[in-house]
Each structure stands twice: as C-alpha cells, then as structure tokens.
Amino acid sequence: FPQDRPFEDTCHGNPSHYYDKAVRRCCYRCPMGLFPTQQCPQRPTDCRKQCEPDYYLDEADRCTACVTCSRDDLVEKTPCAWNSSRVCECRPGMFCSTSAVNSCARCFFHSVCPAGMIVKFPGTAQKNTVCEPASPGVSPACASPENCKEPSSGTIPQAKPTPVSPATSSASTMPVRGGTRLAQEAASKLTRAPDSPSSVGRPSSDPGLSPTQPCPEGSGDCRKQCEPDYYLDEAGRCTACVSCSRDDLVEKTPCAWNSSRTCECRPGMICATSATNSCARCVPYPICAAETVTKPQDMAEKDTTFEAPPLGTQPDCNPTPENGEAPASTSPTQSLLVDSQASKTLPIPTSAPVALSSTGK
C-alpha cells in the first residue's frame, strides 16, 4: 500500500530498526542473542535473553533453572515462566515445616487434633492444624465443619502425641527455658532425644493413610489401608517403613501391612548403634587378635549398642569357641527414627526412654 511507504521509509537507514508490515510500524531490532518480549519491540528494554525450557530469566538477567516439584510430597503451585521460577508447595494434607526458595524443603502431614479437642484452623500448605478445646455442649466430633463434614456413626480417629512422625506446628518460638532444637548436623549424633519441644515435632495425622470409611463404633474387624511403604502400627497409625537404602544395610524382612521393613548390616559388618527395625551405624566386622576366634553368631543381628572395647582388645572374640551362644543381648530402648534432615525436636513421652537415630524414614 503506497500510503505505508512513508512509515516504512522511516526505518530505512537505521540498522537498529525494521518495519513490521503486520503492525505497520517501525520496530526495534533486538541484538543477536536477545529476543523480543512483544511483537514489535520499541526499545532495548523490550528485548531479553531467551532461556532454555525449564529455565527463567532472573533479576540479574541470568538464565536460572526453575525448581522442580518432582518430590512426591510437592505439587506445582505456579508454572515455570520466562521471568519467574516454577513454585512448588506441599501437597494437600501436608504443610511446609522448612521453606526453601520457591519450594519447600520439608513437608509434614497435617496433625490430627488430640482426642477430645477440635479443629480451630485446618492445616494449609504453609501451616499445620491448630486445635482448641471443645466448647461446652459441643461434641468434639462435630464441633467444627472440618471435623463433621457429614454425619457418621464412628468418630474420626484422633492422634495421641507419639514420637513417630515429626511435624511442625507453625508457632515455633521457643522460650528460654530449655528450648532445645536439633541442629541438622547433630540430629544423627544424638543417642537420647530431648525431653520435649514446645511446639515442634508434632505428631502428625496418619502419613500414608488411604482415605477409608472409619470403622463403625464397636467394630473391630476393619482396618486402615496404608499407602505403599507404610505399615499400620500398634496404635493404629500409618507409619513409614524404615528404608534400607544406605549401602551398608540390607533388607532383612519386607514392609508389610502391619509391620515395618527391617534392615540389618550387610555381611561383613556389625551393628554399632542399633535403631528400631534397623541399624544407625554399621562398622566393619572386628578382626580378632591372634589365637582368638570370633563367636559363631550372626553379628548383623546383634541389636545392642556397641561400646568401644578397651584399647588392645577386640569385641566378641573368644580364645576358644566354647559354645555357640550369642552374648546376652538386652532389648534396645524404644528407638525413634528421624529423618537425618529433621531439625526439629520431637515430643517424647515421659514414661519411656527414647533413642534418637538418623536411620531410615
């Protein structure tokens, strides 16, 4: 169209511009390696770097990888865009206890209110459940919409505090009176858990619990269905089976519906520090001093805590194999399996001593 000629002419002789017939305008020509952010850029700021897929352009004009939400406790909240990262959040039923840039480092299951208490604030992706006492004349089972979505004959099972699944209540400021926190690095070194936190290390609702109808009251013949890699413990909670993924461990018994997987030290190793259903520390099988033989027992099965012998001696070595009996093994104290990344203290009942180990999840 001849009437377009004057507009087109204004671009000629200016190498930094070109004429776009579709919009009938002069457009700024983005330098090599930069790409227009709009159809007809007008100025250098309308040009930007083109990042590869799953990368975004950060504030410093660098192509930066978008976070991934591939962990199974995360879901995508906002997608990866040219100028912003993907954002992940904890999946429904979980909340973030340790946040990370555009994601969450640790998700925990929302806690179930203790029996008799009611939900004041249902958990979100960021916050744990908040519970409160029931008001007089209100049944705890139906005291709030969250607790009573539809009438049922049985009440929803409620969790008692147990040192099984650490979760974190969001109100976590600790008072000066002994507010112990487990440092991430120290978590694996503790042999005795701190007495109790103020608001961290909360018992969570059943992790891995597949939604099923609660059992009718008085019926003992139905059970919860747990997700894969979880088992139903004695208290009726779905609890994660321990993992034998450490390369010094092997699976002894598999994860079953009502019992955890058990791990033992691989052949040639002895358990130095036991843990429930596993071993927190395996050490190489001791070499016996000259003229001694090792007691004929499966050392991987020894489940007492190994104490270092006096200098110059070897553990479990006998001058002669007089009998095939293993030494008397005291049953280990109740162990508490904690993810070694957990930086939270856990509630410990005062009635039983508890060992803290970094083994398994």
Epitope: N128, P161, A171
Partner: antibody, heavy 121, light 107 residues
C-alpha cells in the same frame, strides 16, 4: 527469650473497670497457632482461667465472667489487653498473662510474673 | 465446667524420695491435661502436657501419666528445689480449669 509482663492499676474501687495490659517479647502474636490467655489467682486460692485471644483475633471467654470481660490485642506493639467491668472485692487477685505457643495442645508454656490487683472501697 | 480435683492439699517428702501427686477430672478429658509447678512467690511454669509429655527443659525426674479422669504427676528422686505447689489443668473443653493445687513440703 520469651517474656510476658502484666501491668495494671494496683488498686481500684468496686464498680470500676479494671484494665490490664500484657506486654510480651520473643514471639509474635501473628504466628499461626499462637495465643495469649489471662489467668487470675486470688491469694491462697485456685487459678482461674479468664480469657484467651488467638493470633487471628478469635476470642474465648470463661462463661462465668463473659459478660464482664473483653480481651483484645495490638499485634504491632506486642500487647494483649483485658478489661473487667463492674469489679468487686472478689476480683482481688494476682492476674497473669501466659502464652499458648503450641497449635495442638492448649498448655501455657510461659507465664508473666503477675500483677496484683486489689479492689477496695 | 470440668472440675479438676487434687485431693491432697499438702504432701510431705524427703530429698531422694519418690512422690506422686494425683488429679481427678469430673468427666473424661482424654489426655488433655497439663501440669504446672509454682514455686513460692513465683508464677507457674509448665512441666507436663498431654498428660505424659515433658515440656522442654524439665528434668526427667518429672513424669506424667493417666488418661480419661485420673492423672498422676510423679517426682522421682525429689530435690530441695522441687519445693513448690503443683497444679493440674485440663484443656479438653472450655473453660480451661485448674486443680486446687498440691503443696510439696520437703522434710
């Protein structure tokens, strides 16, 4: 370090309104699950829970005193207030504010030192 | 309201002994019970929550037990600094209510 400190008029006359202030530090009342309760203890008598305010401004009162109580907060200045109207000598007590920090269990983990209130004509 | 009864107003014990303070609820409060220690001239301090869970920093000679209506605070190996009044509190339903307290005297 978590601290709470109560302040009040010390002495007031029957039928007046008692105004108490709880000033705290070391935590924020905007944190989910957090709350502050008022409790009183007449000399040599039992502890009596009066009221609680949640982080979301939800309020709970002891039904036996509800008509006379008003609890409120100023999150930005880290203060919680309690007003008791129409006081009489039975309101003479040490008044404590205490924190509920645990979202699951309603125990009061840190208490203020208390302020003594005497209602006397 | 739920009444929390601490039938023993005073208990006498010696250093190194074991003593149990009891608390009875007028109705089922599940395990929604806390215990507090109040030393003379001081404000209460949390010891136990959820009937048996020791609050952080509390010495392990303090243990809690019970559920439903009967609760016990046990102090093993009593120390002179344990001279105090001990209160139970229920938080199963509003209003929160406290026991009348048990004063521990050291012989």
């Amino acid at each position: 370090q978590v601290t709470l400190k109560e302040s009040g008029p010390g002495i007031l006359q029957p039928s007046q309104t008692l105004s108490l202030t709880c000033s705290f530090s070391g935590f924020s009342l905007s944190t989910s699950g957090m709350g502050v309760s008022w409790i009183r203890q007449p000399s040599g008598k039992d502890l009596e829970w009066l009221a609680h305010i949640y982080w979301d401004d939800d309020k709970r009162y002891n039904p036996s005193l509800k008509s006379r109580l008003t609890i409120s907060k100023d999150t930005s200045s880290n203060q919680v207030f309690l007003k008791i109207t129409s006081v009489d000598t039975a309101d003479t007590a040490t008044y404590y504010c205490a924190r509920r920090a645990d979202g699951l269990y309603f125990y009061l983990d840190v208490w203020g030192a208390g302020t003594t209130v005497t209602v006397s004509s | 309201d739920i009444v929390m009864t601490q039938s023993q107003k005073f208990m006498s014990t010696s250093v190194g002994d074991r003593v149990s303070v009891t608390c009875k609820a007028s109705q089922n409060v599940n395990t929604n019970v806390a215990w507090y220690q109040q030393k003379p001239g001081q404000s209460p301090e949390a010891l136990i929550y959820s009937a048996s869970y020791r609050y952080s920093g509390v010495p392990d000679r303090f243990t809690g037990s019970g559920s439903g209506t009967d609760f016990t605070l046990t102090i093993s190996n009593v120390q002179s600094e344990d001279l105090a009044e001990y209160f139970c509190q229920q938080y199963n339903s509003y209003p929160l209510t406290f026991g009348s307290g048990t004063k521990l005297e050291i012989k």
